[in-house]
């Protein structure tokens, strides 16, 4: 598979790696989300490991307010991180793969 | 980097690999999008290589109607593909990484 197809596969499999631990196996509860972030996105989390920060993040992701993060909400979250990465990327034109 | 962080990096770098070819270097025009899909997402595209299909896809992705796909629109697109992959994944519970 091409790198982008592999990337999408990783997005899906990572979600299910954690959503399958407790409760609804197709949703991330707070503890599952916390474990996913800690293990799979340590660069994003940084030092923000306090409870209030997790609660806020969970609340921001949980658009249907069911106290869980479903796959669509997770995709929105990853897109937000990707957009932050992209802003950084665009801020350093010398790092661009190609010039126009 | 962890697999999910690498996946996000691939999402960003793949976009810029093609957006940097013509015109606005932070957006994909129709030919850049076509090349990205053909080379990086062949499984998604399948046999759908006719012009009308590309025009329709381009129109669906181009939410701000500027005839180009910016990074946010590209993220929405990838999220949609990921959600399709996820529906397939959830349809085969024996493929789940964990049971509850």
């Amino acid at each position: 598979a091409c790198p982008l197809e592999k990337a999408l596969d990783v997005m899906v499999s990572t979600f299910h790696k954690y959503s399958g631990k407790e409760g609804d196996k197709f949703k991330l509860n707070k503890s599952e989300l916390k474990e996913l972030l800690t293990r799979e996105l340590p660069s994003f989390l940084g030092k923000r490991t306090d409870e209030a920060a997790f609660q806020k993040l969970m609340s921001n992701l949980d658009s249907n307010r069911d106290n869980e993060v479903d796959f669509q909400e997770y995709c929105v979250f990853l897109s937000c991180i990707a957009m932050m990465c992209n802003e950084f990327f665009e801020g350093f034109p010398d790092k661009q793969p190609r010039k126009k | 980097a962890c697999p999910l962080e690498k996946a996000l990096d691939v999402m960003v770098s793949t976009f810029h690999k093609y957006s940097g070819k013509e015109g606005d270097k932070f957006k994909l025009n129709k030919s850049e999008l076509k090349e990205l899909l053909t080379r990086e997402l062949p499984s998604f595209l399948g046999k759908r290589t006719d012009e009308a299909a590309f025009q329709k896809l381009m129109s669906n992705l181009d939410s701000n109607r500027d005839n180009e796909v910016d990074f946010q629109e590209y993220c929405v697109f990838l999220s949609c593909i990921a959600m399709m992959c996820n529906e397939f994944f959830e349809g085969f519970p024996d493929k789940q990484p964990r049971k509850k």
């Epitope: 609340s59 921001n60 307010r65 | -």
Partner: antibody, heavy 120, light 107 residues
Framework: QVQLQESGPGLVKPSQTLSLTCTVS?????????WNWIRQFPGKKLEWIGH???????NYNPSLKNRLSMSRDTSKNQFSLKLSSVTAADTAVYYC?????????????WGQGTLVTVSS | DIQMTQSPSSLSASVGDRVTITCRAS??????LNWYQQKPGKAPKLLLY???RLHSGVPSRFSGSGSGTDYTLTISSLQPEDFATYYC?????????FGGGTKVEIK
């Protein structure tokens, strides 16, 4: 200390639109909270109307969805409610509340409430 | 919608009494249960959230317990300022729904 203050007409004619605004002070419209409308009927029953929150995300009570509209003005620290085609059954005390980000999303701050009577 | 049923609808008690109010949900609400106190002419005030967590400034004589569909609010030693109406509310899913209330009156 967070304070919420409802404002709007206390009397609305049947079939007209009820419009209320809530002004938030002591806290800005951060993305960490959802801002709700709840009403209490004369018999003291409480009903959740809807809320507006992160990224402008809005959820309405399905029983009112067809008549309901909510919006916010972050520059004024205000959010508002419009309920159309009102009847006497919409007579209630209307509260605006803040929904915390903690488990179960409790309503941790409430306005003092404003009585809206629907009558000709 | 999830239906919330409170019992009793009213009760009479004396200062110092231990008071228990129950709340039953029509389906499992996974501990996402909040309790409020309301006094006449005032807005409700949050007491407990997520079944048993005390909101800031709430006295420790208030406690909550339960799981699944059945939940309880307990006031260990009723004080004069506790005579009020108490409401449960589920925070498990939308739309949010409330119990009908329990009025605690002076015996």
């Amino acid at each position: 200390q967070v304070q919420l203050q409802e404002s709007g007409p206390g009397l609305v004619k049947p079939s007209q639109t009820l419009s209320l605004t809530c002004t938030v002070s002591g806290d800005s419209f951060t993305n960490d909270y959802y801002w709700n409308w709840i009403r209490q009927f004369p018999g003291k029953k409480l009903e959740w109307i809807g809320h507006i929150g992160y990224g402008g995300n809005i959820n309405y009570n399905p029983s009112l969805k067809n008549r309901l509209s909510m919006s916010r003005d972050t520059s004024k620290n205000q959010f508002s409610l419009k309920l159309s085609s009102v009847t006497a059954a919409d007579t209630a005390v209307y509260y605006c509340t803040r929904e915390s980000f903690y488990d179960g999303y409790p309503f941790d701050y409430w306005g003092q409430g404003t009585l809206v009577t629907v009558s000709s | 919608d999830i239906q919330m049923t409170q019992s009793p609808s009213s009760l009479s008690a004396s200062v110092g009494d231990r008071v228990t109010i129950t709340c039953r949900a029509s389906q499992d609400i996974r501990n996402y249960l909040n309790w409020y106190q309301q006094k006449p002419g005032k807005a409700p005030k949050l007491l407990l959230y997520y079944t048993s967590r005390l909101h800031s400034g709430v006295p420790s004589r208030f406690s909550g317990s339960g799981s699944g569909t059945d939940y309880t609010l307990t006031i260990s030693s009723l004080q004069p300022e506790d005579f009020a109406t108490y409401y449960c509310q589920q925070g498990n899913s939308l739309p949010r729904t409330f119990g009908g209330g329990t009025k605690v009156e002076i015996k």
